[in-house]
């Protein structure tokens, strides 16, 4: 085995020593004889020693013995102890007591030999075992006065070589982590929480983040535990990008031909059913009644025009009754209705015209008198000195319920190149001209067109109770919701409690996936904000779809063209949703299209307005727009722009 | 469109008489009364009266019975005002405007001079 | 007979200006009062007919309010073009009556 240099000649020296022991004590006899019993020279003195460096070291201390004790002739005992102890450099021992192992005399010099781990001359310098190859420990060396030790970093231990180290295993005590999970690491552990949630070292426990606090959704955010979920205010027009944090524009996804014709003039602005038009006709000259107009419907029931005086005098309402004109009149207090001629609401334009002749009134479709009907007075009225005649459009001055026979007064139709009395009308032309609202879709099919910026809403009941006295009354809710979306997020149909300013049900389009947090075009199915079912839909297609949704006791189901959803909670979890919403229904609910109230961004998952096409069937009801509550000014009940052609 | 076409000016003598003539396009005719209104030079507007073109008769303000005539013929749409015995504050300008209730389209207006 | 006594017979004003022009009536016409503009060898022209309404190519700087027997025109702020005379006409009863007019000069 090899020794380091330094621990080797320590090593050889006391074998050294031996050899010389014979030379030294025969000079001590040497010296004895010729410098304690004689007085003695320096050459006499260099006899004894043979060299000069012990014989000068010896010399000059030999006379200081002499001065102190006198010469060797006095015979003074401590004077051969002075001199005998002088050439042994060792006595007094110059070594360090704790560092050395020997005190070698040399030749007017000394040699400390150290213990290990002690050096310099005189054994008073530790050595840094550390410094040379950590001390051949595997972690950390402790050097020491004389001596070294191994230790390990925290979280391992040392083995017994007292050298190297092993990973201690934290895991191993169950309660490293209390409720976390525990994972083993080198020299340490970790405490491990699901995503969402972060160790509490005090509680031993998982806590829920809060995201919200960390300012990660541009709008409203909701905690929840484990995750979050970030919403825009959709009323606003607005949606979850792609990041689910931040908010975008809901965009149309299928461009809808929604360009008006300026020389149109649209009658179903005013749901309130007041006049779109209203005509004041004067003359001085006696004149009688003729208008004529193109019309276009695809409505059922409507007024046309109304003409005449004050509701008690004498007037004339055109309306559209199942699809067929009717006359309302009513002469000097006296009422009648007439209904005649073809089914007009099949969605092309005819020209129709009501002409006051003589003795009798005629109005015609394309040309033809489809109804003449004889009647005794005029419509234009005398009062002081000037004959006067209102005349309105899609409307009538006064309430509906005090015609001769009550009808819906909204119409969604369409008149142009109208005619009053023969004269050249440029007031109506020139206000369609700068509104926009009061002109048509250039062209329209059947259904109804939400534009994205408003609702309709009815006051249905979803009760039934039995014929059964006494049993308990069930509740059904069933939508078949026929839709061609222009954008990929909107309220389809809703509930809403404005007691409780509640959202009990929705069904609406979504483009993500919120716990998944995954953009997926599709159609939910939720009880307030709670997501019963989820369906895919091809929302962009341009193509028509069909939703259905069927809520009763127990069930609830989406479709969507005949596909079924996937349920998005556990049957315990469908229950107790169920009977949230059968709470809701037993108190006032109103049933919303296409949109829904001022409500929190967090009462469902979407509360965006729909835009697009839709019609919508309630408990095998089909729902229309004209007999709603209430209805934006920009939803056609019963037209919806076609999809713009594909540019070639 | 609607156009109102008035006889030029005139200038007479008083004690003379003056038809000044308002001929009527764009319209029909017989649908809309017409409407005879004067003003004095530097004078606001006075409304004469009227005639019923369906039936050719004449309603005139009580400052206008007498000399006044209105009349028509509505073989050329043309509608008439005479004035007999003219005085010197008949200088005016008298326009035609057509019935409607308020007077929308209006002649360009003749101007009768009397002066002796 | 419903005379109309209009207000004020003239008025000096500069471009910008706000001028108003009332018209009151003897009797009750209810909303059946006509506003007329009226330049130097022009016939009057239409500008507010009856139910304060402005006619199609007026210029929205006009504007017109009352009923019953007080009625006015508003021009917000004049324009040169509006240097002119204006009358206002009652066509609630016949005898149909204007007022005396009033005109609108340049200060």
């Known amino acids: 085995a090899l020794l380091p240099a330094r621990e080797a000649t320590q090593f050889l020296r006391p074998r050294q020593r031996r050899a010389f022991q014979v030379f030294e004590e025969a000079k001590q006899g040497h010296l004895e004889r010729e410098c304690v019993e004689e007085l003695c020279s320096r050459e006499e003195a260099r006899e004894v020693f043979e060299n000069d460096p012990e014989t000068d070291y010896f010399y000059p201390r030999y006379l200081d013995c002499i001065n102190k004790y006198g010469s060797p002739y006095t015979k003074n005992s401590g004077f051969a102890t002075c001199v005998q102890n002088l050439p042994d450099q060792c006595t007094p021992n110059p070594c360090d007591r704790k560092g050395t192992q020997a005190c070698q005399d040399l030749m007017g010099n000394f040699f400390c030999l150290c213990k290990a781990g002690w050096g310099g001359r005189l054994c008073d310098k530790d050595v840094n075992e550390c410094s040379q190859e950590n001390g051949g420990c595997l972690q950390i060396c402790h050097n020491k006065p004389g001596s070294f030790h191994c230790s390990c970093h925290s979280g391992f231990e040392l083995s017994s070589d007292g050298r190297t180290c092993q990973d201690i295993d934290e895991c191993a005590d169950s309660e490293a982590c209390g409720e976390a999970r525990c994972k083993n690491l080198p020299g340490s552990y970790s405490c491990l929480c699901d995503e969402g949630f972060a160790y509490s070292s005090q509680e031993k426990a998982c806590r829920d983040v809060d995201e919200c606090l960390q300012g990660r959704c541009e709008q409203v955010c909701v905690n929840s535990p484990g995750s979050y979920t970030c919403h825009c205010d959709g009323r606003g027009g607005l949606k979850l990008s792609q990041d689910m944090d931040t908010c975008e524009d809901i965009l149309p996804c299928v461009p809808f031909s929604v360009a008006k014709s300026v020389k149109s003039l649209y009658l179903g602005r005013m749901f309130s059913g007041t006049p779109v038009i209203r005509l004041r006709f004067k003359r001085l000259q006696p004149t009688r009644l003729v208008a004529e107009f193109d019309f276009r419907t695809f409505d059922p029931e409507g007024i046309l025009l109304f003409a005449g005086g004050h509701q008690d005098s004498t007037w004339i309402v055109l309306a559209l009754r199942a699809g067929r004109l009717e006359l309302q009149l009513r002469y000097n207090g006296v009422g009648r209705v007439t209904s005649s001629g073809p089914v007009i609401n099949h969605g092309m334009w005819q020209t129709i015209s009501v002409e006051e002749l003589a003795r009798n009134l005629v109005i015609k479709v394309n040309r033809d008198a489809v109804m003449k009907i004889a009647v005794a007075g005029d419509l234009f009225q005398p009062e002081r000195g000037l004959y006067h005649l209102n005349l309105t459009v899609g409307g009538i001055p006064f309430h509906e319920k005090d015609l001769v026979q009550p009808i819906n007064p909204r119409l969604d139709g369409c008149m142009r190149s109208w005619n009053w009395l023969n004269g050249e009308d440029t007031t109506i032309q020139e206000t369609v001209k700068v509104n926009t609202r009061m002109q048509c879709f250039s062209v329209t099919e059947r259904g109804s067109f939400y534009p994205g910026s408003g609702f309709a809403f009815y006051s249905l009941d979803y009760m039934r109770t039995p014929l059964d006295v006494g049993t308990e009354s069930t509740w059904e809710v069933e939508v078949v919701a026929h839709i061609r979306p222009a954008a990929d997020t909107g309220v389809l149909f809703a509930l809403w409690a404005p007691d409780l300013r509640a959202v009990p049900l929705s069904v609406a389009l979504v483009d993500y996936h919120s716990t998944k947090k995954l953009k997926k075009q599709l159609v939910v199915l939720a009880v307030e904000h709670t997501a019963l079912a989820l369906m895919e839909i091809k929302v962009c297609d341009g193509q028509e779809h069909v939703v259905t949704v069927s809520l009763r006791d127990g069930e609830a189901t989406l479709e969507v063209d005949g596909t079924r959803g996937q349920s998005e909670v556990s049957a315990a979890q469908l229950q107790e949703r169920l009977a949230v919403l059968e709470r809701h229904l037993r108190s006032p609910v109103l049933t919303f299209a296409g949109g829904l109230p001022d409500v929190p961004v967090t009462s469902a998952p979407v509360t965006a307005f729909y835009r697009g096409c839709m019609t919508l069937e309630v408990n095998r009801r089909l729902l229309d727009l004209d007999e709603a509550a209430y209805k934006h000014s920009d939803i056609t009940a019963h037209s919806c722009p076609p999809v713009e052609p594909a540019a070639a | 469109q609607v156009h109102l076409v008035q006889s030029g000016p005139e200038l007479k003598k008083p004690g003379a008489s003056v038809k000044i003539s308002c001929k009527a396009s764009?319209?029909?005719?017989?649908?809309?009364?017409m409407n005879w209104v004067r003003q004095a030079p530097g004078q606001g507007l006075k409304w004469m009266g009227w005639?019923?073109?369906?039936?050719?008769?004449?309603t005139y303000t009580e400052e206008f019975k007498g000399r006044f005539v209105f009349s028509l013929d509505t073989s050329v749409t043309t509608s008439y005002l005479q004035i007999s015995t003219l005085k010197a504050e008949d200088t005016a300008t008298y326009f035609c405007a057509r019935d409607e209730g308020w007077f929308v389209y209006w002649g360009q207006g003749t101007l009768v001079t009397v002066s002796s | 007979e419903t005379t109309l006594t209009q207000s004020p017979s003239s008025l000096s004003v500069s471009t910008g200006d706000r001028v108003t022009i009332t018209c009151i009536t003897s009797?009750?016409?209810?909303?059946?009062m006509n506003w007329y503009q009226q330049k130097p060898g022009k016939p009057p022209k239409l500008l507010i007919s009856e139910g304060n309404t402005l006619r199609p190519g007026v210029p929205s700087r006009f504007s017109s309010s009352g009923s019953g027997t007080d009625f006015t025109l508003t021009i917000s702020s004049t324009q040169p073009e509006d240097f002119a005379d204006y009358y206002c006409?009652?066509?609630?009863?016949?005898?149909?009556?204007f007022g005396q007019g009033t005109k609108v000069e340049i200060k």
């Open positions: 764009g319209y029909t005719f017989t649908n809309y009364g």
């Open positions: 009797t009750d016409i209810d909303d059946d």
């Open positions: 005639i019923n073109t369906n039936t050719g008769e004449p």
């Open positions: 006409l009652q066509t609630d009863s016949v005898p149909l009556t």
